[in-house]
Interface confidence: low
């Protein structure tokens, strides 16, 4: 907290410029008008203020906007954003994707901080749903973003947004999350032809039910073992040997290397030995 002191004669700042870097903290507090600072926030980023000086500038903005900063100020916070607490950010109403991008850029290359998580939460709640442009932006900055959401939060993702999702965005998703995302992906890609559809749907298949896997087995998709191993065990168990053989195509030989791991292990135990023998892989049920 900076004490209130009168501004020395001739030191009142007519604008936000480089001369302020040589003001002591109390001089910044006394001589910089908060309303001027708010209108010239875009200049702050170009001036080499110290951490301590930024604390003073933040304090001035906090006093001017006790209920939370307006978006016109938020958009130009730049590195001052790193000084904000989640409690500060919860007071904001951020609606512009450009504002979101500007602040994410400040934190670029770092883990998602509590400040960023709060900002994103406020933004998405304000929009009501995770639309394609927002998802595109968030996954560009944080590839694991989608998988950090709860199944309940994922339910607000419209199918049209699924087009923005890349395979790597789903790497850390668990089955409960894929259960929510898969039907949306199925809907989003429904008008694509067989091979193109499979390329798009592949990374979501950890949420696919048995009947969809059976349907895929009829389409010569040649699913790789890595994808097969991520399928829901309960969805794989009812598949016949013939269906799994069709589903995997030339990759069926990989079952031998995975015979001790789920879902392959559990699926093998459900099959008749005669049927398994037709694969010629030496699988023992």
């Amino acid at each position: 907290e900076v004490e209130k002191t009168a501004c020395p004669s001739g030191k009142k700042a007519p604008e936000i410029d480089e001369s302020l870097i040589f003001y002591k903290k109390w001089e910044l507090e006394a001589c910089v008008d908060a309303a001027l600072l708010a209108t010239q926030m875009d200049r702050v980023n170009a001036i080499p203020f110290t951490y301590e000086q930024l604390d003073v500038l933040k304090h001035k903005l906090d006093e001017l906007y006790p209920q939370g900063y307006p978006e016109s100020v938020i958009q130009h916070l730049g590195y001052l954003f790193l000084k904000m607490s989640p409690e500060d950010i919860r007071k904001w109403n951020v609606t512009s994707l450009e504002t979101l991008k500007a602040l994410l850029e400040v934190n670029k290359g770092h883990e998602m901080s509590p400040q960023v998580a709060t900002l994103i939460d406020r933004f998405v709640k304000g929009r009501g749903q995770l639309d394609k442009d927002t998802l595109d932006t968030l996954t560009a900055f944080y590839p694991g973003y989608l998988c950090s959401l709860s199944p309940e939060e994922l339910s607000s993702v419209p199918p049209s947004s699924i087009w923005a999702v890349r395979p790597q965005d789903l790497d850390t998703c668990d089955p409960r999350q894929l259960d929510v995302l898969y039907p949306k992906a199925r809907l989003a890609f429904q008008n694509m032809n067989g091979s193109e559809y499979f390329v798009k749907i592949q990374s979501f298949l950890g949420g696919a039910p048995t009947e969809d896997l059976k349907a895929l087995s009829q389409q010569n998709v040649s699913m790789d073992l890595a994808t097969f191993m991520k399928l829901r065990t309960d969805a794989v168990l009812p598949l016949t040997v013939a269906e799994v053989q069709k589903l995997l195509g030339p990759h069926v030989e990989g079952l031998k290397a995975e015979e001790r791991h789920r879902p392959v292990r559990d699926w093998i135990l459900r099959q008749r030995q005669d049927d398994l023998d037709t694969l010629g892989l030496g699988l023992q049920g």
Epitope: D17, E18, A46, I47, P48, F49, Y51, L82, G109, H110
Partner: nanobody, 117 residues
Framework: EVQLVESGGGLVQAGGSLRLSCAAS????????MGWYRQAPGKQRELVAA???????NYADSVKGRFTISRDNAKNTVYLQMNSLKPEDTAVYYC???????????WGQGTQVTVSS
Amino acid sequence: EVQLVESGGGLVQAGGSLRLSCAASGSTFSSYPMGWYRQAPGKQRELVAAISSGGSTNYADSVKGRFTISRDNAKNTVYLQMNSLKPEDTAVYYCNTRSPRVPNDSWGQGTQVTVSS
């Protein structure tokens, strides 16, 4: 990201002069304000002189009239001419674009300036 390499430090008698250089890599160098900072043992890093992208300059009270900061945007270099050096100017000198306000700011190795009495 701008990479910074400082040079020109050394051992000098009180009253002597040194010229420090800071070479920056990065195409956006010319749009940044630049600062020379120094850190003496056991003390906080302090801003000594700053120059805006347009060339306007500012100095800490302790070096006013003795130090001159300048920049050559064509060479991506910023300079600090240090005259009438005093023992209390002894420190490691660094240049940087935005001061120590960003946790991940990439500071160079700095250049040691030692002023003997």
